[in-house]
């Protein structure tokens, strides 16, 4: 289906508004360092262009790529030496390595000061007075800290971020009702651009037929009543949108998730009976919303797998003429019948699978060689559900701030190499599993807890490959991708850690102390414990416990004296005094 | 020690037929599966097909038809009939032992010193 | 159609030299099943290494590999007299009537 002008067919089929989205959240995600209005005034100058090739596709430069005019017009950029280095080089290039080094030298962690919240009056005059930039800035703040953000859910949030303000700022108490909803839209955010995070991962560092693997698996738990064919058509049409997106085509990722959407809408009946309500939506909801759709119920009677994938004389020669679709319809059958495993269990369980065939079916006797295959699978699914029991014990007898402090401890003491930031990062978002899934009923606890732990230690490898200072996180993140967790579940005390020196200048606070909020007074005692962990990697959780017990009490104690500062600077040496005798 | 010997190679017509075998000494071939792989004169190495212990066999996409793979684990031996060969079947013949372990895998650790087919007239 | 394209198809090099060999797949190549022989004159083929970078028993460890999916990469990280003879890379995939070899490379004497 080839046009003559690529940017004349997306704007044509995207439309104004959302192709100028797009193309701002590119730009922004490129070039992450930008001022707005530098990037609004690149947008603009890409759609005035845009609309020269809609009026005659022959015009000049419209029947070029995407890539080559974005690069050229990324590349336009006066300042692009100074503020992104090397990445300057990349101009120097031809498409498609001019792309491939622009989507490299994307900053998982850039070095942007937090977004700080205005005071409600201050958002809802600023929407008032020119909405458009508003929400345009909204977007470009998003994507330029959030490189991988899926571009067209971005679009979807931006819908939200939009509606909630033209419904709060009408309504009498104006911060009641916006600052939830802006909580809420700032949590599933973060929480979506993680989960895309993981998806661009598998792709890029996996390959598709890792992605592809995945999303059979998940879509035949949410579909289990549509057959392998349907299945495996829509893996294709998804593993079609996310490549695109993660490669930074996102013109072309938006229209073909719309495709998606229609495709699914139209073929309800032979895909899921829950789509219904999601099909009568306006189109950014509508993608949204299949994306999000629940689990439709297995069909009565499935047989058992074993007739197919034990008992069949043909299992070795349908494995071996034809891997990808056998092993692909194993995973299909096995995930349709357990909604209630986790997607990393099940593609645990078609790789144990995979390594059985490969070893007997050039054997003698291969029936004899693979018969207990499926009990084989006990311990993979026992090791999870053991797990989730076992850390979901321990939340609910900590709560959620003590069960992150165990986490940090657990993981500082496995790869006490990685940054303080990064291990209370990413050790709080692993933490957060229990009030998200331990709540939930037996049958979705394992699903929930560790494919969400799969996305938060994904940012983990993520962030370490930019700074890599452990060989066994490269390991754990690098050798399979479905065992990741496995892998770092499996690590130890690090025997090898030369302990940090310790630095009385971690542990000396002050009275700015007090004024922070809740979770910022959290971020600063867990920076704490991690330290002390890197200091005396061996100190037992009683003595942990102890000395942080002792750090409450000492804030506490300094934050109700009337001269906090001087109470700060009498007990914190004390503290750490106390501390270090503590942990001798 | 383990030895894979090649056979039966030699001058043929395009459009005859040769048998080739493939005698295992050293271990028991009903345990292992066997390639057939072929070079022809200064050129690279072309996979024909293989046979597992089993005698399950598959071919390359381009061999199926004109050559078959048996074996007969008695004689602790495989062999490769060739049929309506032409003149680019001339080539070295080789069989080789898949690593035990693997089925589908291109990996051979134990190879013969390979036999000589020549098609000509 | 399977294409296993090795790169480069002869290299001239010294003793000491450190040696790359590419080979490029397409399609990917099923689960890193990919392997490398060495070959010498009149001699059949030797398995040096498999599933992408593990070493045969016996093989020096101045052989290693590495890659996954399509690039594959074979390097000697000092050539040694003995070391001069052609490379293949064999690659398996979904389909086990695809199992392919890479055209070859020559390491000779410079």
């Known amino acids: 289906d080839t046009h003559k002008s690529e940017v004349a067919h997306r704007f044509k089929d995207l439309g104004e508004e959302h192709f100028k989205g797009l193309v701002l959240v590119a730009f922004s995600q490129y070039l992450q360092q930008c001022p707005f209005e530098e990037h609004v005034k690149l947008v603009n100058e890409v759609t005035e262009f845009a609309k020269t090739c809609v009026a005659d596709e022959s015009a000049e430069n419209c029947d070029k790529s995407l890539h080559t005019l974005f690069g050229d017009k990324l590349c336009t950029v006066a300042t692009l030496r100074e503020t992104y280095g090397e990445m300057a080089d990349c101009c120097a290039k031809q498409e498609p390595e001019r792309n491939e080094c622009f989507l490299q030298h994307k900053d998982d962690n850039p070095n942007l000061p937090p977004l700080v919240r205005p005071e409600v009056d201050v958002m809802c005059t600023a929407f008032h007075d020119n909405e458009a930039t508003f929400l345009k800035k909204y977007l470009y703040e998003v994507a330029r800290r959030h490189p991988y953000f899926y571009a067209p859910e971005l679009l979807f949030f931006a819908a939200r971020y939009k509606a909630a303000f033209a419904e709060c700022c009408q309504a009498a108490d104006k911060a009641a009702c916006l600052l939830p909803k802006l909580d809420e839209l700032r949590d599933e955010g973060k929480a979506s651009s993680a989960k895309q995070r993981l998806k661009c991962a598998s792709l890029q560092k996996f390959g598709d037929r890792a992605f592809k693997a995945w999303a059979v698996a998940r879509l035949s738990q949410k579909f289990p009543k549509a057959e392998f064919a349907e299945v495996s058509k829509l893996v294709t049409d998804l593993t079609k949108v996310h490549t695109e997106c993660c490669h930074g085509d996102l013109l072309e990722c938006a229209d073909d998730r719309a495709d998606l959407a229609k495709y699914m809408c139209e073929n309800q009946d032979s895909i899921s009976s829950k789509l219904k309500e999601c099909c009568d939506k306006p189109l950014l909801e509508k993608s949204h919303c299949l994306a999000e759709v629940e689990n439709d119920e297995m069909p009565a009677d499935l047989p058992s797998l074993a007739a197919d994938y034990v008992e069949s004389k043909d299992v070795c020669k349908n494995y071996a003429e034809a891997k990808d679709v056998f092993l692909g319809m194993f995973l299909y059958e096995y995930a349709r019948r357990h909604p209630d495993y986790s997607v990393m269990l099940l593609l645990r369980l078609a790789k144990a699978y995979e390594a059985t065939l490969e070893k007997c079916c050039a054997a003698a006797d291969p029936h004899e060689c693979y018969a207990k295959v499926f009990d084989e699978f006990q311990p993979l699914v026992e090791e999870p559900q053991n797990l989730v029991k076992q850390n979901c014990e321990l939340f609910e007898q900590l709560g959620e701030y003590k069960f992150q402090n165990a986490l940090l401890v657990r993981y500082t003491k496995k790869v006490p190499q990685v940054s303080t930031p990064t291990l209370v990062e990413v050790s709080r978002n692993l933490g957060k599993v229990g009030a998200k899934c331990c709540k939930l009923p037996e049958a979705k606890r394992m699903p929930c807890a560790e494919d969400y732990l799969s996305v938060v230690l994904n940012r983990l490898c993520v962030l370490h490959e930019k700074t890599p200072v452990s060989e066994k996180v490269t390991k754990c993140c690098t050798e399979s991708l479905v065992n990741r967790r496995p892998c770092f579940s499996a690590l130890e005390l690090d025997e090898a850690y030369v302990p940090k020196a310790f630095n009385a200048e971690t542990f000396t606070f002050h009275a700015d102390m007090c004024t922070l909020s809740e979770k910022e007074k959290q971020v600063k005692k867990q920076t704490a414990l991690v330290e002390l962990v890197k200091h005396k990697p061996k100190a037992t959780k009683e003595q942990l416990k102890g000395v942080m017990d002792n750090f409450a009490a000492f804030v506490e104690k300094c934050c109700k004296a009337d001269d906090k500062e001087a109470c700060f600077a009498e007990e914190g040496p004390k503290f750490v005094a106390a501390s270090q005798a503590a942990l001798a | 020690e383990v030895q894979l010997l090649e056979s039966g190679g030699g001058l043929v017509q395009p459009g005859g037929s040769l048998r080739l075998s493939c005698a295992v000494s050293?271990?028991?071939?009903?345990?292992?599966?066997i390639n057939w792989v072929r070079q022809a004169p200064g050129k690279g190495l072309e996979w024909i097909g293989i046979?597992?212990?089993?005698?399950?066999?598959f071919y390359a996409t381009w061999a199926k038809g004109r050559f078959t793979i048996s074996r007969d684990n008695s004689k602790n031996t495989v062999y490769l009939q060739m049929n309506s060969l032409r003149a680019e079947d001339t080539a070295v013949y080789y069989c080789?032992?898949?690593?035990?372990?693997?089925?589908?895998?291109?990996?051979?650790?134990?190879w013969g010193q390979g036999t000589l087919v020549t098609v000509s007239s | 159609d399977i294409q296993m394209t090795q790169s480069p198809s002869s290299v001239s090099a010294s003793v000491g030299d450190r040696v790359t060999i590419t080979c490029q797949s397409s399609?990917?190549?099923?689960?890193?099943?990919l392997s490398w022989y060495q070959q010498k004159p009149g001699k059949a083929p030797k398995l040096l290494i498999y599933?992408?970078?593990k070493l045969t028993s016996g093989v020096p460890s101045r052989f290693s590999g590495s890659g996954s999916g399509t690039d594959f990469t074979l390097t000697i990280s000092s050539l040694q007299p003995e070391d001069f003879a052609t490379y293949y890379c064999?690659?398996?995939?979904?389909?086990?009537?695809?199992?392919?070899f890479g055209g070859g490379t020559k390491v000779e004497i410079k």
């Open positions: 599933e992408a970078s």
């Open positions: 080789a032992r898949t690593v035990p372990g693997y089925s589908t895998a291109p990996y051979f650790d134990l």
């Open positions: 050293g271990i028991d071939l009903s345990n292992y599966a």
């Open positions: 046979i597992w212990a089993s005698g399950t066999t």
């Open positions: 064999g690659g398996g995939y979904s389909s086990i009537s695809d199992t392919t």
């Open positions: 399609p990917s190549v099923w689960s890193n099943f």
